[in-house]
Interface confidence: low
Amino acid sequence: RKIPKVGHTFFQKPESCPPVPGGSMKLDIGIINENQRVSMSRNIESRSTSPWNYTVTWDPNRYPSEVVQAQCRNLGCINAQGKEDISMNSVPIQQETLVVRRKHQGCSVSFQLEKVLVTVGCTCVTPVIHHVQ
Amino acid sequence: GITIPRNPGCPNSEDKNFPRTVMVNLNIHNRNTNTNPKRSSDYYNRSTSPWNLHRNEDPERYPSVIWEAKCRHLGCINADGNVDYHMNSVPIQQEILVLRREPPHCPNSFRLEKILVSVGCTCVTPIVHHVA
């Protein structure tokens, strides 16, 4: 049988599904692929024609606690001579991820899923030129 | 370090079952932000290291649709619109957290999963290895 997409109310529920209180979901926090390695090309943030820096945002009540954000170093792009060429633009590339937020309510802890937008790096683009009439 | 409970008067309950599960509010904060990169910007076409976006769909995952970037060229596009092989287009990868239905097909039971996605491409100077 075809499984309907997330958000469809007619999602067929197998008998093995755990009972869940209304308005909440059961989340197993044993993370699948917890220890996988990111194998990005070396130092691409410095070697890129649209280089970027990383900053770490930190929140002990968020999982993961550390979220790394990239910021483009220049408005333009770096040309073959190593100079900034402002006829081109460095722009951020963004990706959504889920985080879990922990909330302290008295002696209990509650959890809320949150979508956050992470700037992953930068790319060099030809600018869009708006012609004024 | 000292164990810091939720607040000083709270019991320090160490009765932890494994694997541990938590109940999470169904309403995802910022749920309705735009998730289609084709609609959100045309950088994938205008970049000197352009990429194609491939739709990866999995109903057992939330979000069910993830867009994967694949660089179009080995080199980068120069000012003349040609591919310059003195430079390299490389993918920018990011680890993201998604929810995986567990047990499968269950509407409100999930497990966190870390996945690696290619978000876009950037143009880099190659690392040249000189042969002795």
Epitope: I29, Y63, R102, V109 | G1, I2
Partner: antibody, heavy 126, light 107 residues
Framework: EVQLVQSGAEVKKPGESLKISCKAS????????ISWVRQAPGQGLEWMGG????????NYAQKFQGRVTITADESTTTAYMELSGLTSDDTAVYYC???????????????????WGQGTPVTVSS | DVVMTQSPDFQSVTPKEKVTITCRAS??????LHWYQQKPDQSPKLLIK???QSISGVPSRFSGSGSGTDFTLTINGLEAEDAGTYYC?????????FGQGTKLDIK
């Protein structure tokens, strides 16, 4: 992979001070606790104290109070243990050990030691 | 301070045997009891946390049980590589305290 790398072996004279470092990599240094545990030759394990970088506070065993100082430098992800007024009884292998945090139950550190440094042998002799 | 007492101090066992090491706390420590293995000239290694919780990468022959004041570490089907000293550790109150250790020798 999480690694704790400690500074090298030390030879000290009685009355001198000792400072050992423990460099952490492969984990979120700030949210974990780092404890120091020592082991005298042929003896068992003895906890000296620990620090949770995010809280910035250290706790010490009564036996070492006033003689030990544990600090952490977040910028270099390094913890330090300083022991003053050394005597021959302080001859031991000194270990740093990581205390993981427990985000899901609301705790910053949970006190069991999941990763250990390789140990720093210290000899105190005149 | 919470005093942790292990028994036996020393045990000589043949491979494939079942080994039991006990640890007694001088007061109720709930389930905040952890077990470590230490081989000669090596750092201790976490085997079991919170009395009975297994640790990723640790062979399934190691198991733990108990709560309150009495705890047990069991090795089902001892292997030659299990030789070393085993320590229990309580973390319910500061200071952390360890048992005196149980040296396990393989015949």
């Amino acid at each position: 992979e999480v690694q704790l790398v400690q500074s090298g072996a030390e030879v000290k004279k009685p009355g001198e001070s000792l400072k050992i470092s423990c460099k952490a990599s492969g984990g979120s240094f700030r949210s974990y606790g780092i404890s120091w545990v020592r082991q005298a030759p042929g003896q068992g394990l003895e906890w000296m104290g620990g620090i949770t970088p995010i809280l910035g506070t250290a706790n010490y065993a009564q036996k070492f109070q006033g003689r030990v100082t544990i600090t952490a430098d977040e910028s270099t992800t390094t913890a330090y243990m300083e022991l003053s007024g050394l005597t021959s009884d302080d001859t031991a292998v000194y270990y740093c050990a990581r205390e993981p945090n427990d985000f899901w139950n609301g705790y910053y550190t949970t006190h069991h030691f999941d990763y250990w440094g390789q140990g720093t042998p210290v000899t105190v002799s005149s | 301070d919470v005093v942790m007492t292990q028994s036996p101090d020393f045990q000589s066992v043949t491979p494939k045997e079942k080994v039991t090491i006990t640890c007694r706390a001088s007061q109720n420590i709930g389930s905040a009891l952890h077990w470590y293995q230490q081989k000669p000239d090596q750092s201790p290694k976490l085997l079991i946390k919170y009395a009975s919780q297994s640790i990723s990468g640790v062979p399934s022959r190691f198991s733990g049980s108990g709560s309150g004041t009495d705890f047990t570490l069991t090795i089902n089907g001892l292997e030659a590589e299990d030789a070393g000293t085993y320590y229990c550790h309580q973390s319910t109150s500061l200071p952390h305290t360890f048992g005196q250790g149980t040296k396990l020798d393989i015949k």
